[in-house]
């Protein structure tokens, strides 16, 4: 788009005539105050379009914005619209007239606003005053727009002097109405209730002075209306709450409850929903599974956790071998039940520095007047393996025996291995396994005993070596779920003296 003359500001004489031309690659049109003006449109042979606006007998009232835009253009890009501002200094016109709605400026947030008092002459000095005050306010003035700034709720007037005459504008009224984008939060005293109990929901909005609440709920659909109560909370400004209270809930009251909040100034709205469940009677339900056999490691701390859902809140008890457990004063046992959400609970039994005696049969029982649930498991205390003894002997039969004894829980596995080249073993040569009829012609005999009092297994294994012709490093390794231990012994042939 090309405007001739280009502007962006022109000062024209009263009573004069002036011609403005706009041209572009499609049909163009001159507009003022969103209205098309009488103009002459033409199309040139090179397919350019133009429009000529002739302003005749100009007066101060012709002062203002003029736009050239492509005809029928929708969703204009900035370069599809050109602006020109024309001043026609006219001593007979003081301030340009305003529409009635321009005199009432409603603010809905802290924002810079413009008091649109405009004059016809850009050379005039214009000042802003409170309606009843003489002091000029220090607010910047733009002759094309007016005074822009942040204003208090007040009445304002603009003043200018034309010749020797002081001229006042109409009064402008600024009213700050507290409105913001709506952000609703909905919560319920309980989202699960038993029939006969009350349902109470709260819908809260902060930051708006005037809002309208509307509730949708299952009862409403069947024509049974409940009157919500609106409350203006004083703990902070513009804090409004709507309370929906349904006494003596029925099963049919289960469902979605929606709070819709609107404010009419900016047409903002928001809604949030919450689900309410009305149950016939209370319940307790286990969530997830806890294996029938649980493990703890000796001298370590172990927390056993049970997760369940319940309504109403239950009583939780723990038992060991049918005896009720409580927090021990010595701090060896800690019991806690946490409410992790409205109806979900986590109950924990913590054994601090586990002892062998704490193995046994544990039960957690959760109950209230309507229901109960219990969960039991056996606790096994795992003890890391220890090799207690590794000895070598030379019976008269000519064979050589190595005996390995160890303990642990669960039952240890035993692995025998040997290495021939003492210098290179075990770094360079992997040890070879013994005991399953290897080339060493070894034999293995293993006995396992369970010691009830210590609650652990003892393993005794004897390795018989038929003929040893050079020194041999023999290793006994014990392994179970919680660890491993090993010892080594060097077995020398009968013919060699032991050094």
């Amino acid at each position: 788009l090309v405007i001739t003359p280009p502007g962006p500001e022109l000062i024209l004489n009263v009573s004069s005539t002036f011609v403005l031309t706009c041209s572009g690659s499609a049909p163009v049109v001159w507009e003022r105050m969103s209205q098309e003006l009488p103009q002459e449109m033409a199309k040139a042979q090179d397919n350019t379009f133009s429009s000529v606006l002739t302003l005749t007998n100009l007066t101060g009232l012709d002062t203002g914005e003029y736009f050239c835009t492509y005809n029928d253009s929708r969703g204009l890009e900035p370069d599809e619209r050109k602006r020109l501002y024309i001043f026609v200094p006219d001593p007979t016109v003081g301030f340009l007239p305003n529409d009635a709605e321009e005199l009432f400026i409603f603010l809905t947030e802290i924002t810079e606003i413009t008091i649109p008092c405009r004059v016809t002459d850009p050379q005039l000095v214009v000042t802003l005053h409170e309606k009843k005050g003489d002091i000029a306010l220090p607010v910047p003035y733009d002759h094309q727009r007016g005074f822009s700034g942040i204003f208090e709720d007040r009445s304002y007037i603009c003043k200018t002097t034309i010749g020797d005459r002081e001229v006042d504008s109409d009064a402008y009224y600024v009213y700050r109405l507290q409105v913001s984008s709506i952000n609703v939060s909905v919560n319920a005293v309980q989202t699960v209730v038993r029939q006969g109990e009350n349902i109470t929901l709260m819908c809260i909005v902060i930051g708006n002075e005037v809002v309208n609440f509307e509730w949708m709920y299952p009862r409403k659909e069947s024509g049974r209306l409940v009157e919500p109560v609106t409350d203006f909370l004083l703990d902070m400004p513009y804090h409004i709450r709507s309370i929906l209270h349904i006494p003596s809930a029925e099963l049919e009251d289960s469902g979605t409850y929606t709070c819709n909040v609107t404010e009419s100034v900016n047409d903002h709205q928001d809604e949030k929903a919450i689900n309410i469940t009305v149950v016939e009677s209370g319940y307790v339900r286990l969530l997830g599974e806890v294996g029938a056999l649980q493990f703890a490691e000796l001298h370590r701390s172990r927390t056993l956790q049970v997760v369940f859902e319940a309504y109403p809140p239950p009583t939780v008890l723990w038992f060991k071998d049918n005896r009720t457990l409580g927090d021990s004063s010595a701090g060896e046992i800690a019991l806690s039940t946490r409410n992790v959400s409205e109806t979900r609970y986590v109950s924990e039994l913590t054994l601090v520095r586990v002892k062998v005696a704490e193995a046994g049969h544990y039960t957690m029982r959760a109950f209230h007047e309507d229901a109960e649930v219990q969960l039991s498991f056996q606790l096994q205390i795992n003890v890391p393996v220890r090799v207690l003894e590794l000895s070598e002997s030379h019976p008269d039969s000519g064979e050589q025996t190595v005996r390995c004894r160890g303990r642990g829980m669960p039952q240890p596995n035993i692995i025998w291995s040997a290495c021939r080249d003492l210098k290179r073993c075990p770094r360079e040569l992997p040890p070879m396994l013994l005991g399953n009829s290897s080339e060493e012609e070894s034999q293995l005999e293993t006995n396992v005993t369970y010691w009830e009092e210590e609650q652990e297994f003892e393993v005794v294994s004897t390795l018989r070596l038929q003929h040893v012709d050079r020194p041999l490093s023999v290793r006994c390794t014990l392994r179970n779920a919680v660890g491993q231990d090993m010892q080594e012994v060097i077995v020398v042939p009968h013919s060699l003296p032991f050094k």
Epitope: I110, D231, F232, L233, D235
Partner: antibody, heavy 118, light 113 residues
Framework: QVQLVESGGGFVQPGGSLRLSCAAS????????MSWVRQAPGKGLEWVSA????????YYADSVKGRFTISRDTSKNMLYLQMNSLRAEDTAVYYC???????????WGQGTLVTVSS | DIQLTQSPDSLAVSLGERATINCKSS????????????LVWYQQKPGQPPKPLIY???TRESGVPDRFSGSGSGTDFTLTINSLQAEDVAVYYC?????????FGQGTKVEIK
Amino acid sequence: QVQLVESGGGFVQPGGSLRLSCAASGFTFTNYAMSWVRQAPGKGLEWVSAISGVGGSTYYADSVKGRFTISRDTSKNMLYLQMNSLRAEDTAVYYCAKAPHWGPFGSWGQGTLVTVSS
Amino acid sequence: DIQLTQSPDSLAVSLGERATINCKSSQSVLYRSNNKKFLVWYQQKPGQPPKPLIYWASTRESGVPDRFSGSGSGTDFTLTINSLQAEDVAVYYCQQYYSTPYTFGQGTKVEIK
């Protein structure tokens, strides 16, 4: 014409109870938050308690929390302050005041004197 | 809680002179999204309840003479009485109504010098 008239003040021993009333007229009672404000002899103003308009949420100064209860009867346009476990430092003129929500106390009653002494 | 501190505690001013009372808030009572300051000034004469003069920190109550004016930021406020008159002798209080517990300044006594 807005009118607030307090009553129920008087002489009471420490530990005793008293119930103050405030009769409101000339405005829509539930459209406004109502407060009690007190003034000890020769001292400044101290806000005591408030109740919000329609919903009736209640608020208290720490100095009276747990001892005083604000309430109202919307059918009678009455505001109340139940004062229990009274102490000598509760001696004051008690005013009832009305305010638009989130606004200043625009109207005040003339006050009622409460004296707590043995 | 928001504390309000007034200064001075008392003030003696000649008739026709200006009286200035300050009120300092321990935290802002300005609601930023609409620039409203939740502070009111009251005048109290002996044996009478307080009377509101200026609310929103700077808006005069109707019927209050224009020699009374209020100004201030979010935490520092001023009540100015231009050209003090004999009937202005009273105790003046500021009060915040931003949030409960509502709080008052300790009061400033204005007398004629």
